[in-house]
């Protein structure tokens, strides 16, 4: 348990300490305090570098001191013969004696007390970004007006996050723009538009001045745009280095402005607006789009009509056109539907005639019906040739979809009658 | 057939055989047989055969049997209580509608009907072919098909022949323009059992074809002149009857 003070005595003190001893003491005072360790008596066998017998004071990995020999106070008003001040709350004291002592040595007597440390001044690293306030047992950080203390309780920043922009048009600027932006801040702005609209950000080169990148090209202060899994930036420097128009292809955009402790500039100002999400004009062969436009955007509806001889097969129902809507995600509905050649299917059989199997039954294919000659002929004309028409029927130029009719040839005997002379 | 020659069914593929009464008919399309009214007046469900030269029972079993669906006798044919005493053979024509269509081939195919133009008006001397399994010089019924070629003759030639076994006065026999008189050459004639068969004449507009100019009807005496129903006069009735009693499959 941490204590505010304590006493440490060598073994058998004030009698002579024994040979071959190693003893250690772990001193701990409460958090926020340092340790003042002082010796009032020191009588340890002297050797070079205190190699034989010694008392060692260790703070963490650092040896604060190693003592041996005899000491006496230089100050008649103080019994202290040696002292140590450490700004940490833990200290280790180790006493060692070797196998022989040529004389009788009485060892040491030491005391420690918890002392206040000034965290604001005692360390190389300043614990607070702005104002440091010391108190007994600790310190606290504070901030100038309009700054707030971050959750780490050390860094100050401006309160520049949490804004959500939902209007279809707007303007966003860095804090204090065009005055220098605050150091050591992370500003997050959210733009959230209705689905189907993409955020388009517009910046002018002269409206951007952010601390430049270091020699390795890393931005010290940076402006980043994040739209879903796409990132634009980081951007920094004098004059905006990115595209002046950023089409995010998303209805949600996060703007993150991160600054460090130094080098504040005037910052940035941007405009944004919501563009209806564009849908690319897809290549749909054998079809016509109505209406025809150079650009299609969210909520646009087109009728895709198949060219003659092509049809949309949805499930197994044939149609000649379908509607497609530009959706909020920038994709067309019904995008799986395609215009494919009409299939007229197997031609119907006819009585007393036949149709040769066509190579194909698709649009434009030709079939020919013939009658079983010489006993049947085609009565209703048309020549027997049919083509696969756009409506999915086999069509003849004369008869249309009507099938040819094979009727018996009349009055033709297979062999002529010859009278036998008697 | 008197004075005729042996024929093959391929010479007369339209020839239909009726076994009761023993008679003939002419196939005019897949569903219809044309015959004489007196053939079917007593049997409205005749059994018919096509495609065989011989009408021997064993041969008929292998030929195509036709099943009638309905018999249509010309409305002008006078039905008698005692048909044997008939002296009026005017309008001796009937149609038999078949249940199933006939499949055509080398031994079965129809004969054409006459056109309605004057080209199909017969002149004396025009030749026609008759065929059948009726009485011959030697036997009452022929087993194998017989045929003969005979010329059209003036109606008076038929009138002049004395009826062989008259059932009434000679004057009682009716002769009308609905009848064709043919024969009188080399004793070639049709006879009992040939009734209903076609008197086939070469089509004036297509020499490769024959049409049914007449149907074997009656005669005063076998081996002289015979009378044939003039089919041309009935083409309208034939067409109307077939149209009114056809299935959509035939239309």
């Amino acid at each position: 348990e941490p204590t505010m003070y304590g006493e440490i005595l060598s073994p058998n003190y004030p009698q002579a300490y024994p040979s071959e001893v190693e003893k250690s003491w772990d001193i701990e005072v409460p958090e926020g305090y340092g340790i003042h360790l002082y010796f009032t008596h020191l009588d340890i066998e002297l050797s070079e570098n205190c190699a034989y017998d010694s008392v060692q004071i260790i703070s963490g990995d650092t040896e604060e001191g190693r003592l041996c020999g005899q000491r006496s106070s230089n100050n008649p008003h103080s019994p202290i013969v040696e002292e140590f001040q450490v700004p940490y709350n833990k200290l280790q004291v180790i006493f060692k004696s070797d196998f022989s002592n040529e004389e009788r040595f009485t060892g040491f007597a030491a005391y420690y007390v918890a002392t206040d440390i000034n965290e604001c001044t005692d360390f190389v690293d300043v614990p607070c970004s702005h104002f440091c306030n010391n108190f007994i047992g600790g310190y606290f950080c504070s901030c100038p007006p309009e700054y707030f203390l971050h959750d780490d309780m050390k860094n100050c920043g401006v309160n520049c996050s949490g804004d959500v922009f939902t209007a279809l048009i707007g303007e966003i600027a860095s804090p204090n723009y065009p005055k220098p932006y605050p150091e050591n801040s992370r500003c997050e702005y959210q733009i959230r538009l209705e689905k189907g609209f993409q955020v388009v950000v517009t910046l002018r080169r002269e409206d951007f001045d952010v601390e430049a990148a270091d020699s390795a090209g890393n931005c010290l202060d940076s402006l980043v745009f994040v739209a879903g899994d796409r990132q634009f930036g980081p951007y920094c420097g004098h004059g905006f280095p990115g595209p002046l128009n950023i089409e995010t292809k998303s209805n949600a955009l996060d703007i993150i402005f991160q600054t460090d402790l130094t080098g504040q500039k005037k910052g940035w100002k941007l405009r944004y607006h919501g563009d209806p999400m564009p849908c690319p004009k897809e290549d749909t062969p054998n079809s016509v789009w109505e209406p025809a436009k150079a650009k299609y955007v969210f909520r646009d509806v087109v009728q895709i009509t198949c060219l003659d001889g092509f049809e949309v097969v949805e499930g197994r129902v044939g149609a000649t056109s379908f509607y497609s809507t530009c959706q909020s995600n920038g994709k067309w509905s019904n995008s799986k539907l395609k215009c494919q050649p009409v299939d007229c299917g197997i031609p119907e059989s006819i009585e007393n005639g036949k149709v040769e199997d066509p190579e194909s039954t698709l649009f434009g294919s030709v079939i020919r019906y013939t009658c079983e000659e010489p006993y049947y002929y085609m009565e209703n004309g048309g020549g027997g040739e049919y083509h696969c028409a756009g409506n999915g029927s086999w069509v003849n130029e004369v008869l249309g979809p009507e099938l040819p009719k094979c009727v018996p040839v009349c009055g033709v005997p297979r062999e002529p009658f010859e009278e036998k002379q008697r | 057939i008197i004075g005729g020659s042996d024929a093959d069914i391929k010479n007369f593929p339209w020839q239909v055989f009726f076994d009761n009464p023993w008679a003939g008919g002419a196939l005019i399309n897949e569903y219809w047989v044309l015959t004489a009214a007196h053939v079917v007046e007593g049997n409205r469900e005749p059994t018919m055969y096509v495609g065989s030269t011989s009408v021997q029972t064993s041969r008929l079993a292998k030929s195509k049997m036709l099943t009638p669906e309905h018999v249509f006798i010309h409305p002008g044919w006078k039905l008698l209580e005692v048909p044997e005493g008939r002296t009026n053979f005017d309008n001796d024509i009937a149609l038999v509608r078949l249940k199933d269509p006939v499949k055509m081939g080398p031994t079965v195919s129809p004969i054409c009907l006459p056109g309605t133009s004057s080209d199909y008006n017969l002149m004396d001397g025009d030749l026609g072919l008759i065929s059948g399994w009726g009485r011959t010089e030697k036997r009452d019924r022929a087993v194998r098909l017989k045929a003969a070629r005979l010329p059209v003759a003036p109606l008076r030639k038929c009138k002049e022949v004395k009826v062989e076994k008259p059932t009434a006065d000679a004057e009682a026999y009716v002769f009308t323009p609905n009848m064709i008189c043919a024969g009188g050459e080399k004793g070639m004639d049709s006879c009992k059992g040939d009734s209903g068969g076609a008197f086939a004449v070469q089509d004036p507009n297509d020499k490769t074809k024959f049409y049914a100019a007449g149907l074997v009807s009656w005669g005063p005496q076998c081996g002289t002149y015979g009378l044939y129903t003039r089919v041309k006069n009935y083409v309208d009735w034939i067409m109307k009857t077939m149209q009114e009693n056809s299935t959509p499959r035939e239309d």
Partner: antibody, heavy 118, light 109 residues
Framework: EVMLVESGGGLVKPGGSLRLSCAAS????????MSWVRQAPGKGLEWVAT????????YYLDSVKHRFTISRDNSKDTLYLQMNSLRAEDTALYYC???????????WGQGTLVTVSS | QIVLTQSPATLSLSPGERATLSCTAS???????LHWYQQKPGKAPKLWIY???NLASGVPSRFSGSGSGTDYTLTISSLQPEDFATYYC??????????FGQGTKLEIK
């Protein structure tokens, strides 16, 4: 007279194969498209497959696609149905039928019974 | 696929009565491709009416067929004992599997 006579049916285990035949007579077989239709016991008619007159074009019920193959030999006036990977639900009386105007089936065989059971 | 629904599933009537059998398609069918078959127990189906209204060979004239679009009807003007059987409607559409209705059983009351 038009006649269609099916054969080749029988009892087969699931996953097994059968080949049905349909012998045609009384008409010019090569002039007609043909179909197989099945009827499960006590159930209605279900079309299975169709083949064009020359055999170049075939159409199948989705559930038999890639398992059944319809074919024909016009020189033998015979229609076939090769059935592989048979399932219990393929149990039925299988009819062959001739296709006519409007793809109506104007002549049917008497059927051959296929039973798929373990 | 085009589904054909026949109604009623069973029709009980007496000889001499008029019978009306209905076949409704889930989407429009060409009248040229709508057919009816008659099937008696243990027998193969027989083509009865083809292309909506044409009687097949040997079918008595008391039978008639009509309809268009999605609604088709087979009518028997005066039932005869031999007419009691199951009737199926059937459609062909080039993009579809050929389908049959589930059948209407016409039975003697």
């Amino acid at each position: 007279e038009v006649m269609l006579v099916e054969s080749g049916g029988g009892l087969v285990k699931p996953g097994g194969s059968l080949r049905l035949s349909c012998a045609a007579s009384g008409f010019t077989f090569s002039n007609y498209a043909m179909s197989w239709v099945r009827q499960a016991p006590g159930k209605g008619l279900e079309w299975v497959a169709t083949i064009s007159s020359g055999g170049s074009h075939t159409y199948y019920l989705d559930s038999v696609k890639h398992r059944f193959t319809i074919s024909r030999d016009n020189s033998k006036d015979t229609l076939y149905l090769q059935m592989n990977s048979l399932r219990a639900e393929d149990t039925a009386l299988y009819y062959c039928a001739r296709l006519f105007t409007g793809h109506a089936m104007d002549y049917w065989g008497q059927g051959t019974l296929v039973t798929v059971s373990s | 696929q085009i589904v054909l629904t026949q109604s009623p599933a069973t029709l009980s009537l007496s000889p001499g009565e008029r019978a009306t059998l209905s076949c409704t398609a889930s989407s429009s069918v060409s009248s040229s491709y709508l057919h009816w078959y008659q099937q008696k127990p243990g027998k193969a189906p027989k083509l009865w009416i083809y292309s909506t209204s044409n009687l097949a060979s040997g079918v008595p004239s008391r039978f008639s067929g009509s309809g268009s679009g999605t609604d088709y009807t087979l009518t028997i003007s005066s039932l005869q004992p031999e007419d009691f059987a199951t009737y199926y409607c059937h459609q062909y559409y080039r993009l579809h599997p050929i389908t049959f209705g589930q059948g209407t059983k016409l039975e003697i009351k």
